[in-house]
Each structure stands twice: as structure tokens, then as C-alpha cells.
């Protein structure tokens, strides 16, 4: 499939352009040693022709060596000469009179991704029906363009939504920020698994996955190896660890001899139980109370400590 | 186990074109980019092309560039590159590779272009 | 673009003995984020390229620590102890420091 160009010489439109030509685009990346051919061909080949470049305005003319014009293939120049411009288009005087080629866009490409990040990155502990919102962002280099892809258990979801956008980065900022959000609305057992999401430049990829566990519905259970007896000697410190598996995590009250216990400088009743310095009154029945904030559901376990003076 | 099979290599003549493909299995195809790299009769290295992994953003070697067109299709795992306007030095075994972190760290066994009149 | 020059052949080894490849860069090849973007393949007679080595110095997944990476900003050294049978083959380093990314003209390891 051969080409054929026929020049007619017109001193009064000395540039070529394409009837569907309104403005071009010059892709280019910042290298010191790649040059880029803007191109404005011309229908003369011994133009005197002039390359200008907006905003601020620059003008470069052929010197010889990594500057030229060539009517068959356009003004050449090094790419980071013209990385600060917006606009670019070749200038050429004929008898006085100024002519210009078509405008030509100048887009900066980047590739390089410094990383991905996942939100939340891990313990993602959903129940049937509930809303998954996963947020991927990609930090990369200035001028790059970022496509995002997710797999995850069913990527065939009916009711999944992704929204891809750049993120305001700080003015004299040396990065860029890309979000993709994934959002299944009414999360099923089907869902559960890994999510991965991946970002690329076309030069570059990175990826970052996070596991996602669907319950069947609320629920609150203690773990194994809670325990049932703690012995301890006067003047240690004793940790009793209320041991659950939950969703979404219960609310845990202590009580001893059925009486509620508050937090204080001897005490610390949270997800375990601490007595800072243990007497011989602390000896008793501990009770710890589980109550799943979304169902109300109550699972309670008894802890008898005996306090040995030595 | 990560398979890439490369196919469509063939004999053309200078000025014609080829369609190569890419197979991929045993791996997640959507979340890795994907390039061309072949390999010329003096056993040279040369990266050809590159695409994201949703297809929109493409590289070209300034070699190949407005001649040759990479393009992938996911839904069936498949990476493709167009070549036209075929000359006696894009010769070569065309390798696709997998990319990640700018890394090819799986390539196919190759498939063999001839351009010759 | 950037040049990767290396050496046809490699100096002659002995099956068990220890060996250095070298591969040099026209340009640095340490980025601003402060990683060495190099990496090593190696092709066995037959086979396509394995990735031994990245960010010059990081071996690859499966990849034997009989390998190790090494080097400056433009100089670089793949280094094999031990070399066995299966390390026949030519080693290719390449930059990924700057677009479009290019590789060595490959080192071919000479058995004694």
C-alpha cells in the first residue's frame, strides 16, 4: 500500500494540511536526547521557516545540527526545548508576508507510577446487603495518563459502579494522584474474595489487592482458647483478653460478681481486661458480656480469677 | 502456570501487512500490561510496543511508529499487533511479554516474520 | 535514546567456578526516587528471555541466589557463583530509566 504525494508549489499556503486538520497534537517526553518532529509539511522546500512556541512565545530556527525543517517531514527539534509550551506552529516569511501552519497541541508524556494503594487496605468485614466501597489511588509522575482495571470475585456485577478521577495535587507538587472507586451496592456471599486493582500507564503497571470477607448476617461468637480460670499472685499485673470472632466487632462490657466495671487508674475493662497491680479482693467471677451492635445478639462467658498470697 | 503463545507470524512481502496475536493463560490478563519485544536475526532485543491494561494508553518504538498498532481484548485474554507497511528489517521473532512494575517478567516462545521480496 | 553496551562474550568459566558480566549505561540509570532502574534476562539456547534481575540488584521470583546484581549509575555487574550447566545462554541487560526502554546487545557465557 504505496502513497503518492503530489506538491503543488503556493506561495500563498506554503504549509499542507489535511481539510480535517484544525489543530494537531505533538506528543513528546521529557528527554534530553529525544528530539520531535512537529509536522507542518510544506508545498516549497527551500521555506525559511521558523518554529513558534506559546506561552511565553519562543522562536527556534534550524541551526544546522539538532534543529531543521524539512518540507517532506516537518520542523525537528529536541522535545524538551518546547516541554513548557501549550501550543505550538511553524512560521514562515515570503516576501515580508508571515504564513502559519495549523496549531499543534503539546501533550508531555510520563509513565512512571510510584505506587497504588488500596482503602481500606485490609480487614474488610462486610454482611449481605451492605454497601462495599473500595478506593484505589495511583500516585505517579507529572504527564501521565492513567487507565485503571479491578478483578475481584464478580467482575460481572450487576451492580457495581467505578468511578475513575484525578485528584488536586499542591501547586509545585512532583506528583500526580489517580482514584478509581469500586462500589458494589448490595454486597452477597458471592462477593467475598480478593480485589486487585491495577493502574497503568501503557509503560508501566502497578498493582494492589485487599481481601474482602461477606458474612451471612450480623453475628458475635467467642474465640477459641477464651478463658475459664486465671490465677495470679498479689501485686502482678493481669490481662484477661475477651477472645471474639464478629461482625461488625460487638460491644464488650465487664462485670464482676455482676456488678458493671468501669475503666480507672486500677483498671482497664476494654477488649482485655487489665488489673495493674491484683490484691487479694480481686478475687471473683469476671463476666464478660458480647452484644453485636446490629442484631442485639448476647454471648457471655465467665472468668473466675484467684488471687494466691505468696 | 502463566502461558504466553504468540501466532500469525508469517513470510510477507515488503509493503504488506500482518496481524499477530497473543494468547494469554494462567493468569489475571486485565490487570497486567502488555508489550511486544522482538528479537532480530543478529539476536539484537527490541521493545516494539506497549498498551495499559484497559487499552487506552499505547507506546510505540519510533521504528514502528504510525506503521505498526498494538490493541488488547480482555474478554478473551488476547493481545494483538496490526503491522503495515511491512519492511525487510522488521525481519524478527516477535515476542509478547507480560509487564508489571515496568518489568517483563513472562514472554511467549515467539512467532517468526519474514519480510522478503 | 540510551545505549546499553556490553561485552559479545564473557571471560571463559569453568562449570563451578564464579563469573562477572558487565554492562554499561550512556546515561545514569539512577532515577530521582532512588532506585537503579537495570535489569538482567537471561536466554537459554532455545528459549525466550528470563527475567533474572531487577532494580539492578533484586532477584526475580525463582530465580537462584547463585545471582546476584551489582553496579553504579552507569556501570554494572550480573555476578554467578557456582555456574552450572543451566546458566548457558546470553545474559541482555536493559534500562527502564527513560522511555523508550532498550536492552544490551547481549553477553554470551563462554564455557572453558
Known amino acids: 500500500a504505496s502513497v503518492i504525494y503530489v506538491y503543488v508549489q503556493d506561495y500563498r499556503s506554503p504549509f499542507i494540511a489535511s481539510v480535517s486538520d484544525q489543530h494537531g497534537v505533538v506528543y513528546i517526553t521529557e528527554n534530553k536526547n529525544k528530539t520531535v518532529v512537529i509536522p507542518c509539511l510544506g508545498s516549497i522546500s527551500n521555506l525559511n521557516v521558523s518554529l513558534c512556541a506559546r506561552y511565553p512565545e519562543k522562536r527556534f530556527v534550524p541551526d544546522g545540527n539538532r534543529i531543521s525543517w524539512d518540507s517532506k517531514k516537518g520542523f525537528t527539534i529536541p522535545s524538551y526545548m518546547i516541554s513548557y509550551a501549550g501550543m505550538v506552529f511553524c512560521e514562515a516569511k515570503i516576501n515580508d508576508e508571515s504564513y502559519q501552519s495549523i496549531m499543534y497541541i503539546v501533550v508531555v508524556v510520563g509513565y512512571r507510577i510510584y505506587d497504588v494503594v488500596l482503602s481500606p487496605s485490609h480487614g474488610i468485614e462486610l454482611s449481605v446487603g451492605e454497601k462495599l466501597v473500595l478506593n484505589c489511588t495511583a500516585r505517579t509522575e507529572l504527564n501521565v495518563g492513567i487507565d485503571f482495571n479491578w478483578e475481584y470475585p464478580s467482575s460481572k456485577h450487576q451492580h457495581k459502579k467505578l468511578v475513575n478521577r484525578d485528584l488536586k495535587t499542591q501547586s509545585g507538587s512532583e506528583m500526580k494522584k489517580f482514584l478509581s472507586t469500586l462500589t458494589i451496592d448490595g454486597v452477597t456471599r458471592s462477593d467475598q474474595g480478593l480485589y486487585t486493582c491495577a493502574a497503568s500507564s501503557g509503560l508501566m503497571t502497578k498493582k494492589n489487592s485487599t481481601f474482602v470477607r461477606v458474612h451471612e448476617k450480623p453475628f458475635v461468637a467467642f474465640g477459641s482458647g477464651m478463658e475459664s480460670l486465671v490465677e495470679a499472685t498479689v501485686g502482678e499485673r493481669v490481662r484477661i483478653p475477651a477472645k471474639y470472632l464478629g461482625y461488625p466487632p460487638p460491644e464488650i462490657k465487664w462485670y464482676k460478681n455482676g456488678i458493671p466495671l468501669e475503666s480507672n487508674h486500677t483498671i482497664k475493662a476494654g477488649h482485655v481486661l487489665t488489673i495493674m497491680e491484683v490484691s487479694e479482693r480481686d478475687t471473683g467471677n469476671y463476666t464478660v458480656i458480647l452484644t453485636n451492635p446490629i442484631s442485639k445478639e448476647k454471648q457471655s462467658h465467665v472468668v473466675s480469677l484467684v488471687v494466691y498470697v505468696p | 502456570e502463566v502461558q504466553l503463545v504468540e501466532s500469525g507470524g508469517d513470510l510477507v512481502k515488503p509493503g504488506g501487512s500482518l496481524k499477530l496475536s497473543c494468547t494469554a493463560s494462567?493468569?489475571?490478563?486485565?490487570?497486567?500490561?502488555m508489550s511486544w519485544v522482538r528479537q532480530t536475526p543478529d539476536k539484537r532485543l527490541e521493545w516494539v510496543a506497549s498498551i495499559s491494561v484497559g487499552g487506552s494508553y499505547t507506546y510505540y518504538a519510533d521504528s514502528v511508529e504510525g506503521r505498526f498498532t498494538i490493541s488488547r481484548e480482555n474478554a478473551k485474554n488476547t493481545l494483538y499487533l496490526q503491522m503495515n507497511s511491512l519492511k525487510s528489517e522488521d525481519t524478527a521473532l516477535y515476542y509478547c511479554?507480560?509487564?508489571?512494575?515496568?518489568?517483563?517478567?513472562?514472554w511467549g516462545q515467539g512467532t517468526s516474520l519474514t519480510v522478503s521480496s | 535514546d540510551i545505549v546499553i553496551t556490553q561485552n559479545e562474550l564473557s571471560n571463559p568459566v569453568t562449570f563451578g567456578e564464579s563469573v562477572s558480566i558487565s554492562c554499561r549505561s550512556s546515561k545514569s540509570l539512577l532515577y530521582k526516587d532512588g532506585k537503579t532502574y537495570l535489569n538482567w534476562f537471561l536466554q537459554r539456547p532455545g528459549q525466550s528471555p528470563q527475567l533474572l534481575i531487577y532494580l539492578m540488584s533484586t532477584r526475580a521470583s525463582g530465580v537462584s541466589d547463585r545471582f546476584s546484581g551489582s553496579g553504579s549509575g552507569t556501570d554494572f555487574t550480573l555476578e554467578i557463583s557456582r555456574v552450572k550447566a543451566e546458566d548457558v545462554g546470553v545474559y541482555y541487560c536493559q534500562q527502564l530509566v527513560e522511555y523508550p526502554f532498550t536492552f544490551g546487545s547481549g553477553t554470551k557465557l563462554e564455557i572453558k
Open positions: 494462567g493468569f489475571s490478563f486485565s490487570i497486567y500490561g
Open positions: 511479554a507480560r509487564e508489571l512494575d515496568g518489568n517483563y517478567d513472562y
